[in-house]
């Protein structure tokens, strides 16, 4: 009973494997929010090139729950949020910061998906006594992928198959935890 | 596509050990938890347990402790049941599913029929 | 561990009509029920999560409610294809059980 005064506004779904959020409204509780970040591509000259490993993105950090029916992660997850129009990667974060958008003309390039993790998070469920987790796959980095006029949403479609088939050997490997292990910590958590 | 492919039927002798696979396709077996389920003839669905393939962790139901051994192999995407000192009693369809939680069932196989001869 | 007692045992119906099963938990388990369906000489295939939650690609008539003890899974108009066995199953505490389940036959 006691549940919907735990549970606030700002828990938020995690999308399950395939779907991947436009970027989220402000969330109450978040910590290191919105840090903008270039996606570690080394810088060009801004206008002398059009190949898309020349631009760069925004890879917004928010701050949430996840949530499964009732249940609510014990501790909020960060997922990353690809976000912005892309622009070459020198002039991007000094564009950002004078509040100026570099559009490309001709091809749209769009910031999607590159890269994603999964992550195992402990859930509490109200009146439950099993030890729950839950797998939950985040994006790990943001990548520009040039679409064109004529393919514009096949393209933006087609990355809920790729994250479907996630290359392997891409998350950082906890060491082995037996399940007695989590249902300790689950219990402390209540 | 999400997909578990299950090993084919065993036919086995009373007091041998079978071990059975599950092979997922269009995703890492290592981002879910692979349960088993065993369906004996005209009767209902029984929990055995659950495997956490990325590291081993496991939980099964009191029922199948010392029956039951889950394993799993990250390299070839495979979840793997051994069942040993089989009787008639463990004649039935064992399932394997994959579930983002491991407390209910997305994702299921197609099932391995067991059938166990004395 | 923690029974679920399905009930009735055979339904029959006739397509287009509402149709209900009924799960009750031998104690109180918040929602946390989940509903499955098997087809004859298929796989179990997740209906509805914790009580009344629908599932991707599911078809809207299936609908589920309840809480505590007792729970009802519905189907608002039959078809043809709905004919399986339905199987509830907690999650509240380990291990996860199921119910017996039951079998919707046409008449």
């Known amino acids: 009973q006691g549940w919907q005064a735990f549970k606030n506004d700002a828990t938020e779904i995690i999308p399950e494997l395939g779907e991947y959020p436009e970027p989220p409204p402000e969330l109450e509780n978040n910590k290191t929010m919105n840090r903008a970040e270039n996606g570690g591509r080394p810088p060009h000259h801004p206008f002398e090139t059009k190949d898309v490993s020349e631009y760069s993105c925004r890879e917004l950090h928010f701050t949430r729950y996840v949530t499964d029916g009732p249940c609510r992660s014990a501790k909020p997850v960060t997922e990353l949020v690809c976000s912005g129009q892309c622009g070459p990667a020198r002039l991007l974060p000094n564009a950002i910061g004078r509040g100026k958008w570099w559009r490309p003309s001709g091809p749209d390039f769009r910031c999607i998906p590159d890269r994603y993790r999964a992550q195992r998070v402990q859930l509490l469920c109200p009146g439950g006594e099993a030890p729950r987790a839950r797998k939950v796959r985040l994006v790990a980095s943001c990548k520009c992928k040039r679409l064109t006029r004529f393919h514009n949403q096949s393209e933006l479609k087609d990355f809920g198959t790729e994250a479907a088939r996630p290359q392997k050997g891409r998350k950082p490997r906890p060491r082995a935890r037996s399940a007695k292990a989590n249902q300790a910590e689950l219990e402390n958590a209540y | 596509e999400v997909q578990l492919q299950q090993s084919g039927a065993e036919l086995v002798r009373s007091g041998a050990s079978v071990k059975l696979s599950c092979t997922a396709s269009?995703?890492?077996?290592?981002?879910?938890?692979v349960h088993w389920v065993k369906q004996r003839p005209e009767q209902g669905l029984e929990w055995i347990g659950w495997?956490?393939?990325?590291?081993?962790?496991?939980e099964y139901a009191p029922k199948f402790q010392g029956k039951a051994t889950m394993t799993a192999d990250t390299s070839s995407n495979t979840a793997y049941l051994q069942l040993s000192s089989l009787t008639s009693e463990d004649t039935a369809v064992y399932y394997c599913?994959?579930?983002?939680?491991?407390?209910?069932?997305?994702?299921w196989g197609q099932g391995t029929t067991v059938t166990v001869s004395s | 561990d923690i029974l679920l007692t399905q009930s009735p045992a055979i339904l029959s119906v006739s397509p287009g009509e509402r149709v209900s099963f009924s799960c009750r938990a031998s104690q109180s388990i918040g929602t946390n029920i989940h509903w499955y369906q098997q087809r004859t000489d298929g796989s179990p295939r997740l209906l509805i999560k914790f009580a009344s939650e629908s599932i991707s690609g599911i078809p809207s008539r299936f609908s589920g409610s309840g809480s505590g003890t007792d729970f009802t899974l519905s189907i608002n108009s039959v078809e043809s294809e709905d004919i399986a066995d339905y199987y509830c199953q907690q999650s509240n505490s380990w291990p996860l059980t199921f119910g017996a389940g039951t079998k919707l036959e046409l008449k």
């Open positions: 495997i956490d393939p990325e590291n081993g962790d496991t």
């Open positions: 269009g995703f890492n077996i290592e981002d879910y938890y």
């Open positions: 599913n994959g579930g983002y939680g491991n407390f209910y069932f997305d994702y």
